[in-house]
């Protein structure tokens, strides 16, 4: 059970002579000045008796009258020095001083731990005038004390530019231990030592700490706060908390989970965002990270066609942004794709495979062995070629595009012809005589037009010349062949 702290105050009579001994008398003050609005608390501490040496500041008035001695030094009367009470209780304490009536406009301010208390505090000043002096009682009340109200309170009064300071009144709010540092959740490596810290304060002190693991106490003897628990290592997740004990009772910290770092779970929902002829953009949802941040991911790709003997391709990438463009793929091919990711402990398994296909692309190579010759009898140019290798067609051939450029005496014109996919030869009409014809051929798929072959040139003579040998695609390194017939 939690025991209640005692409420301590040392009562002393407030004033000698005609002034009231406590605020609960029948003596009605002449004037009451509240510093701030607020109700009076149920619990009031009586002002206290003189008798101890006075430590507050004293002002010595210089004013004297013809028939009197100098006025005695001004000082706050002694009051209660230390108040101990429990949290949420009410408290009221006072400062009192007798001021000769010759002083006008005296005000009392309250200070806590060196800072003036302004604003909405429950402070009231009461004036009790007499023939020669006015007794001033400044009361300060707190309706429900918190730990933050702990501290040293003083009154200050200014007279003739002199500051009079009361003895301090120490307020000590006692309660259950209050945590200033609680254990934190952690992700730890299996069988590796780690520390947890717990710190709690009163008052009242001392505060003792017990550690709890999975609902069982770890230490038989309590440790004085602050306490550091060294855990030699865990093999499975555990929940730790600490108990803080003082004379008021016990407070339990939040329970914190200590997780064991593990390899991540495989990514899920690998999906195709976009496909081109030679690339596939994939995304994935990372799996559980195993209580350790992902570092990077690996994408495994293999051609999924039954006849393919293609090797496995592995692409490494950063863990973010869960997106990767797989490049250097073949057009019109099927691929199985999987993703795995790693953290500091190791790699996840590969995600379940997904099937992805590249689209048709434009051919990546030009037709081979292009040959051009003049058939003078029909006034045509015959063109022959070999289709590009199937692997480099990057799709289904739909035909060929033939570019033929005619140049004569500074005049140049280009014409384009389309031919069907079955052919490997074409015939074009001679456009200009006494001219050079330059021919280039490109393969065409639904994915687009591939690169044009190297140019092959043939000279078309004026009418009546003899038909000579054909012109062909040059061997590598031979540029710009011209056959003059």
């Amino acid at each position: 059970a939690i025991t209640e702290a005692r409420e301590e105050a040392k009562p002393y009579p407030l004033f000698p002579g005609p002034f009231p001994g406590s605020l609960q008398t029948d003596h009605t003050p002449l004037l009451s000045l509240p510093h701030a609005s607020g109700y009076q608390p149920a619990l009031m501490f009586s002002p206290t008796q003189p008798g101890r040496p006075h430590t507050g500041n004293v002002a010595i008035p210089q004013v004297t009258s013809v028939e009197s001695k100098p006025l005695p030094p001004l000082a706050f009367k002694h009051t209660v020095g230390h108040i101990i009470l429990s949290e949420h209780k009410g408290v009221k304490f006072n400062c009192s001083i007798s001021v000769p009536n010759i002083y006008q406009d005296t005000t009392i301010s309250w200070w806590k731990d060196g800072k003036e208390l302004l604003g909405a505090h429950h402070a009231i000043t009461q004036f009790y005038p007499d023939d020669e002096v006015t007794a001033i009682i400044a009361s300060f009340s707190i309706t429900s004390v918190q730990r933050s109200d702990n501290g040293s309170y003083i009154c200050k009064m200014k007279i003739n530019n002199e500051e009079i300071v009361s003895d301090p009144i120490y307020i000590e709010v006692q309660g259950l231990p209050h945590f200033t540092k609680q254990p934190e959740s952690m992700n730890v490596t299996r069988n590796t030592a780690f520390n947890l810290t717990c710190q709690a304060v009163g008052p009242p002190e001392p505060v003792n700490i017990f550690w709890v693991q999975n609902s069982s106490r770890v230490n038989e003897q309590p440790e004085k706060s602050p306490s550091v628990l060294t855990v030699p290592g865990l093999t499975e997740m555990a929940v730790f908390s600490c108990e803080a004990h003082n004379d008021k009772g016990l407070t339990v910290s939040k329970g914190v989970q200590i997780n064991i770092k593990a390899i991540p779970s495989p990514p899920t929902e690998v999906s195709i965002r976009n496909s081109t002829a030679h690339s596939i953009l994939i995304s994935w949802v990372p799996g559980f990270d195993g209580y350790s941040p992902f570092r990077n991911c690996s994408i495994q790709v293999k051609e999924a066609d039954p006849l393919s003997n293609g090797s496995v391709m592995i692409f490494n990438t950063s863990a973010l942004p869960h997106l990767y463009q797989i490049k250097q793929l073949q057009a019109l091919a099927n691929y199985s794709i999987g993703v795995s990711c790693m953290n500091e402990i190791g790699w996840s398994a590969v995600s379940p495979w997904i099937l992805a296909s590249t689209t048709e692309g434009a051919p990546s190579v030009a037709p081979l062995n292009v040959t051009v010759f003049l058939n003078e009898s029909s006034d045509n140019v015959d063109i022959r070629w070999m289709k590009p290798p199937t692997k480099q067609q990057d799709g289904e051939l739909v035909g060929y595009r033939i570019s033929h450029v005619w140049q004569s005496a500074g005049i140049s014109k280009e014409l384009l012809e389309e031919v069907g996919q079955n052919g490997s030869r074409a015939r074009i009409s001679v456009q200009v005589h006494n001219a050079t014809c330059t021919v280039r051929i490109a393969a065409v798929t639904r994915g687009g037009v591939g690169p044009f072959s190297d140019p092959v040139k043939i000279f078309i003579p004026a009418h009546g010349w003899v038909d000579y040998a054909p012109s062909s695609t040059p061997a590598p390194g031979n540029a710009d062949p011209v056959l003059i017939i």
Partner: antibody, heavy 117, light 107 residues
């Protein structure tokens, strides 16, 4: 030619452990995940788990977590499965199977395990 | 876990017949389904993957079809060497699972 050669039949006592091996040849060991499958009563197939020899990423069927431990030895291109705390229910045929990226394209010949006192 | 249900434990057929073995997934598995053939005393052998792609060397009388939750392995012109157990297998999500198998036997 791709081959998966498993260790021979095992007769062990209840409570003991056993380690079955699967030696591979004919392909690059680190490029393909190796799975293990249990076949009960000569019929139904149950996936135990898989290991990626390239990076040692492992995944287990929850049902076999704590029962099976998968490892590999890259230097000998061999995969291993250790089964512990054996009971009569573990007396079945166990296969290693290569993940061809779209199903298990090559299987070992199977290892028969008999648990008996 | 995804359950793969092969409703027929046994199917009777004659040589030359056409037979369809079905498999139903308890949830959508896309096209991530493979089919295996297992003969007594042997390891399973991959026939079909990605639902309908025939593995190299597998006779073209074996065809796979379906998507989502319903899948079929069809053997047209059944041969005596086709008499075996057939298993479907989903690899769409972990844990990977298999059907209980369908035994193809002669009438």
């Amino acid at each position: 030619e791709v081959q998966l050669q498993q260790s021979g039949p095992e007769l062990v006592k209840p409570g003991a452990s056993v380690k079955i091996s699967c030696k591979t040849s004919g392909y690059t060991f680190t490029e393909y995940i190796m799975h293990w499958v249990k076949q009960s009563h000569g019929k139904s197939l149950e996936w135990i788990g898989g290991i990626n020899p390239n990076n040692l990423g492992i995944i287990y069927n929850q049902k076999f977590k704590g029962k099976a431990t998968l490892t590999v030895d890259k230097s000998s291109s061999t995969a291993y499965m250790e089964l512990r705390s054996l009971t009569s229910e573990d007396s079945e045929v166990y296969y290693c199977a290569r993940d061809g990226y779209f199903g298990f394209d090559y299987w070992g010949q199977g290892t028969t395990l008999k648990v008996s006192s | 876990d995804i359950v793969m249900t092969q409703s027929h434990k046994f199917m009777s057929t004659s040589v030359g017949d056409r037979v369809s073995i079905t498999c139903k997934a308890s949830q959508d598995v896309g096209t991530s389904v493979a089919w295996y053939q297992q003969k007594p005393g042997h390891s399973p052998k991959l026939l079909i993957y990605w639902t309908s792609t025939r593995r190299t060397g597998v006779p073209d009388r074996f065809t796979g079809s379906g998507s989502g939750t319903d899948f079929t392995l069809t053997i047209s012109n059944v041969q005596s060497e086709d008499l075996a157990d057939y298993f479907c297998h989903q690899y769409n999500s972990y844990p990977l699972t298999f059907g209980a198998g369908t035994k193809l036997e002669l009438k």
